[in-house]
């Protein structure tokens, strides 16, 4: 599986970097950080255990979405 | 288990590039950021940058101009290149893994500091 | 002194959710040796007289029964944005 890969970046033109997720079951996730007045911070990658979720962060949310297709 | 192995040069003169390297011994280097902190004598921690072994980097944006980190997944190895330094850049420099999940920051093993001066 | 509970405390600027949260202890000489994350997780062979607890800004680290090798500087952490950023540690010194 193929999936983007990047870290607290404020943009997905920096979010371009492609992984190669070689263990059996991995998918692909995307971490999305809003918080009020602050901008969206975007961090993806791999995960074994990849799971939908939102939570609290600071005055705003974290969410987290999974997909297993390649750079999905 | 884990081990962290750092090396580097120690004194510097202002306007230098200060390159460290750090090894990783033992788990999984493909799963994790690796991370450089830092701590001025006396002082606290000051986070850095990071990298994985796709090469995807995150920095502290107040030194992101001076700053790289790069790796080498043929030898679980990567490093830190500070370029332009000044007295305020001394400060024991530690590698760190980032086992933070959904780009969270989570630094649980550490390498045993290098001591970088710059002075002229 | 040794035996007795010590309890630091960390004030977040503002509000992070109790995931975002972690402890360290160091020595002098020695690199940071992560305590606590998620506030309250006692991270890989830590000792249990060391608890956390806290949410949103405040956080507490709690060490039970103070032990010689107990005696460090501690270290709170956000870890849920870029950059990460630190305490500015606060000292446990032998009475």
């Known amino acids: 599986l193929l999936c983007y890969s990047c870290k607290a970046q404020v943009s997905n033109e920096d979010c371009l970097q492609v992984e190669n997720c070689t263990q059996l079951g991995e998918q692909c996730w995307t971490a999305r950080i809003r918080a009020v007045g602050l901008l969206t911070v975007i961090s993806k990658g791999c995960s074994l255990n990849c799971v939908d979720d939102s939570q609290d962060y600071y005055v705003g949310k974290k969410n987290i979405t999974c997909c297993d297709t390649d750079l999905c | 288990q884990v081990h962290l192995q750092q090396w580097g040069a120690g004194l510097l003169k202002p306007s230098e590039t200060l390159s460290l390297t750090c090894a990783v011994y033992g788990g999984s280097f493909s799963g994790y950021y690796w991370s450089w902190i830092r701590q001025p004598p006396g002082k606290g921690l000051e986070w850095i940058g990071e990298?994985?072994?796709?090469?995807?980097?995150s920095y502290k944006p107040s030194l992101k101009s001076r700053v790289t980190v790069s790796v080498d997944t043929s030898k679980n190895q990567f490093s830190l290149k500070l370029s332009y330094v000044t007295a305020a850049d001394t400060a024991v420099y530690y590698c760190?893994?980032?086992?933070?999940?959904?780009?969270?920051?989570?630094?649980?093993?550490w390498g045993q500091g290098t001591l970088v001066t710059v002075s002229s | 002194s040794p035996g007795e509970r010590a309890t630091l405390s960390c004030r977040a600027s503002?509000?992070?959710?109790?995931?975002?949260l972690a402890w360290y202890q160091q020595k002098p000489g020695q690199a940071p040796r992560l305590l606590i994350y998620?506030?309250?997780s006692r991270a890989t062979g830590i000792p249990e007289r060391f608890s956390g607890s806290g949410s949103g800004t405040d956080f507490t680290l709690t060490i039970s029964g103070l032990e010689p090798e107990d005696f460090a500087v501690f270290y709170c952490?956000?870890?849920?944005?870029?950059?990460?950023?630190f305490g500015q540690g606060t000292k446990v010194e032998i009475k």
């Open positions: 503002q509000s992070i959710g109790s995931t975002y």
């Open positions: 998620g506030a309250s």
């Open positions: 952490q956000q870890c849920g944005s870029s950059p990460p950023t």
């Open positions: 760190a893994r980032d086992r933070g999940d959904y780009g969270d920051f989570l630094f649980d093993y």
């Open positions: 990298i994985n072994h796709s090469g995807s980097t």
